[in-house]
Interface confidence: low
């Protein structure tokens, strides 16, 4: 359905709210080291463009596509040269070369400072001066530190915000009602755009194929009462919007979504039993609601899956006839009777049948070559099954903050070419599996942990990829999609690398350390156990946990002491030395 | 990098015949459906052709039919489509395109396209 002016079409499907909000976003998240003032006036002159639209679809402009008025106005940044460089670049090319640029210098770790939270009172004295400017505010810091945060669902979590704050300033305690719903928002919100980022990077370096493949696992295992067909409906509609999103195209994006939250609210006698409560609920809510639906019960008389994919004399036709349709039909089959399995392990079942299916219908005798293809499943099957079970049995026995150091000893050991601060946030969140899924029952472990594993892995490729510096990872990333947590799992130590020479700064401690919070303090000792590993590589555990010991006694010791930094300056060169001991 | 080369485009005269060739490389051409589209001078883009992966599923627009013939072979990682009875209509930029689609119900998926070859039918 074409319309005279796009932008008008957009400015009246979504509201001026949302509109506003989403065009806000946009900017954010292509000029990232933008002022706030500067985006809200870029963002109200489109604005009050799309209302001369809405007034008059065939007025001057209104005709252009959404990426020509939006980088046409992104290219009238005065300072864009002197603040992004080459990006400037960009402004040079003709669309849709243009915003390809633009995507392509979406930054994943912009050179911003860390939020800092304000007293309660300050916070609700600017919500209560100024709502909206407080809000625009949220979205803009928000996206322009997460270039891939699901739009839409950015609206979302505002919306929450403006709620705590609405609720929380006219309460008797602020901080003991707000802080907690503040946090909340926070971890939710990164959760959220690491999922994102994992999705844009299966569309943009795999294809929408790969996308579109995990999309029918993954709502295979959510709605498995739903038909074949029904899925495909919806993965179509899914990849479409998510496309959108992680090409920038935000005011598409959001309008599909509602659709997509439409249509299956109509049509939920034909998908799940579970969508009833979240179609009640306003648009926002509703669709953030619906992705996170839990799965469905699966339908009791499920035939055996054999009967179609190894029994059957027609495999090989089925195949042949429709390649694609027959192992989506498979991946499917299989996902709605396995809600127990990760969905990349799904996906790696479906790839291994696929290569089963070309070798054997090549062959002599078919159905004799492929009449075993479930049994080589059960290795495949087995190898996250053991991992989550021998992970989760180490968390149990550390605890966290334990937990994550074996991690980071074990990642550190694998790349120690990665930069420390990378090894430090990517194992301190592989850390965080154990909190988020032991202790759920053994049949959601599984999609849980490895499912998060490669949300967490994405992370650590996308940083990677800005700076290349070791050729492991850069494997393990662009190889395979599905195969990238087992390939980082298989991963030993680096034989070839060259341990890094000893630097007695990285282990000079002051007094400040005492002052910081305790997850600040984790960091710390975590960077230097980082530098322990990536000095002496080869060090054993038993080494390293001397070391780990000896530096907490000596900071506790020290913070303890009347005069702080005195100690540290005269205690600190001993730890370091006794640790260079302890690892020689 | 996914390279898709359109060639066997000319000038020829109504009535006669021309055999368009696809050379596709960068990718596994046996795992894609692939398509003919074309642009007629001052015109969209027209949907010409389609054919699955191995050739079993083969379809064609309505104003080419019995005309236009699509194949493949995917040991040569090769795309053609032979055009029978020409008519100035047929005057056009033709493009081959790969399809990404996952399920071959439902639309296709149009993700790489080659440069064009062009075909002019005229006396």
């Known amino acids: 359905d074409t319309h005279k002016s796009e932008v008008a079409h957009r400015f009246k499907d979504l509201g001026e709210e949302h509109f506003k909000g989403l065009v806000l976003v946009a900017f954010s998240q292509y000029l990232q080291q933008c002022p706030f003032e500067e985006h809200v006036k870029l963002v109200n002159e489109v604005t009050e463009f799309a209302k001369t639209c809405v007034a008059d679809e065939s007025a001057e402009n209104c005709d252009k596509s959404l990426h020509t008025l939006f980088g046409d106005k992104l290219c009238t940044v005065a300072t864009l040269r002197e603040t992004y460089g080459e990006m400037a670049d960009c402004c040079a090319k003709q669309e849709p070369e243009r915003n390809e640029c633009f995507l392509q210098h979406k930054d994943d770790n912009p050179n911003l400072p860390p939020l800092v939270r304000p007293e309660v009172d300050v916070m609700c004295t600017a919500f209560h001066d100024n709502e909206a400017t407080f809000l625009k505010k949220y979205l803009y810091e928000v996206a322009r530190r997460h270039p891939y945060f699901y739009a839409p669902e950015l609206l979302f979590f505002a919306a929450r915000y403006k709620a705590a704050f609405a609720e929380c300033c006219q309460a008797a305690d602020k901080a003991a009602c707000l802080l907690p719903k503040l946090d909340e928002l926070r971890d939710e919100g990164k959760a959220s755009s690491a999922k994102q980022r994992l999705k844009c990077a299966s569309l943009q370096k795999f294809g929408d194929r790969a996308f579109k493949a995990w999309a029918v696992a993954r709502l295979s295992q959510k709605f498995p009462k739903a038909e074949f067909a029904e899925v495909s409906k919806l993965v179509t509609d899914l990849t479409k919007v998510h496309t959108e999103c992680c090409h920038g195209d935000l005011l598409e994006c959001a309008d599909d979504r509602a659709d997509l939250a439409k249509y299956m609210c109509e049509n939920q006698d034909s998908i799940s039993s579970k969508l009833k409560e979240c179609c009640d609920k306003p648009l926002l809510e509703k669709s953030h609601c619906l992705a996170e639906v839990e799965n469905d019960e699966m339908p009791a008389d499920l035939p055996s899956l054999a009967a179609d994919y190894v029994e059957s004399k027609d495999v090989c036709k089925n195949y042949a006839e429709a390649k694609d349709v027959f192992l989506g039909m498979f991946l499917y089959e299989y996902a709605r009777r396995h809600p127990d399995y990760s969905v990349m392990l799904l996906l790696r079942l479906a790839k291994a049948y696929e290569a089963t299916l070309e070798k054997c219908c090549a062959a002599a005798d078919p159905h004799e070559c492929y009449a075993k293809v479930f049994d080589e499943f059960q290795p495949l099957v087995e190898e996250p099954q053991n991992l989550v079970k021998q992970n989760c049995e180490l968390f149990e026995q550390l605890g966290e903050y334990k937990f994550q150091n074996a991690l980071l000893v074990r990642y550190t050991k694998k790349v120690p070419q990665v930069s420390t601060p990378t090894l430090v946030e990517v194992s301190r969140n592989l850390g965080k599996v154990g909190a988020k899924c032991c202790k759920l029952p053994e049949a959601k472990r599984m999609p849980c942990a490895e499912d998060y594993l490669s949300v967490v892995l994405n992370r650590l490729c996308v940083l990677h990829e800005k700076t290349p510096v070791s050729e492991k990872v850069t494997k393990c990333c662009t190889e395979s999609l599905v195969n990238r947590r087992p390939c980082f799992s298989a991963l030993e130590l680096d034989e070839a690398y060259v341990p890094k020479a000893f630097n007695a700064e990285t282990f000079t401690f002051h007094a400040d350390m005492c002052t910081l919070s305790e997850k600040e303090k984790q960091v710390k000792k975590q960077t230097a156990l980082v530098e322990l590993v990536k000095h002496k590589p080869k060090a054993t555990k038993e080494q390293l946990k001397g070391v780990m010991d000896n530096f907490a006694a000596f900071v506790e010791k020290c913070c303890k002491a009347d005069d702080k930094e005195a100690c540290f300056a005269e205690e600190g060169p001993k730890f370091v030395a006794a640790s260079q001991a302890a690892l020689a | 990098e996914v390279q898709l080369v359109e060639s066997g485009g000319g000038l020829v005269q109504p009535g006669r015949s021309l055999r368009l060739s696809c050379a596709a490389s960068?990718?596994?051409?046996?795992?894609?459906?692939m398509h003919w589209v074309r642009q007629a001078p001052g015109k969209g883009l027209e949907w010409v052709s389609g054919i699955s992966w191995n050739g079993n599923k083969i379809t064609y627009a309505d104003s080419v039919k019995g005309r236009f013939t699509i194949s493949r072979d995917n040991a040569k990682n090769s795309l053609y489509l032979q055009m029978n009875s020409l008519r100035a209509e047929d005057t056009a930029l033709y493009y081959c395109?790969?399809?990404?689609?996952?399920?071959?119900?439902?639309?296709?998926?149009?993700?790489?396209w080659g440069q064009g070859t062009l075909v002019t039918v005229s006396s």
């Open positions: 960068g990718f596994t051409f046996h795992h894609y459906a």
């Open positions: 395109v790969r399809d990404s689609s996952l399920f071959i119900v439902g639309a296709p998926t149009f993700d790489h």
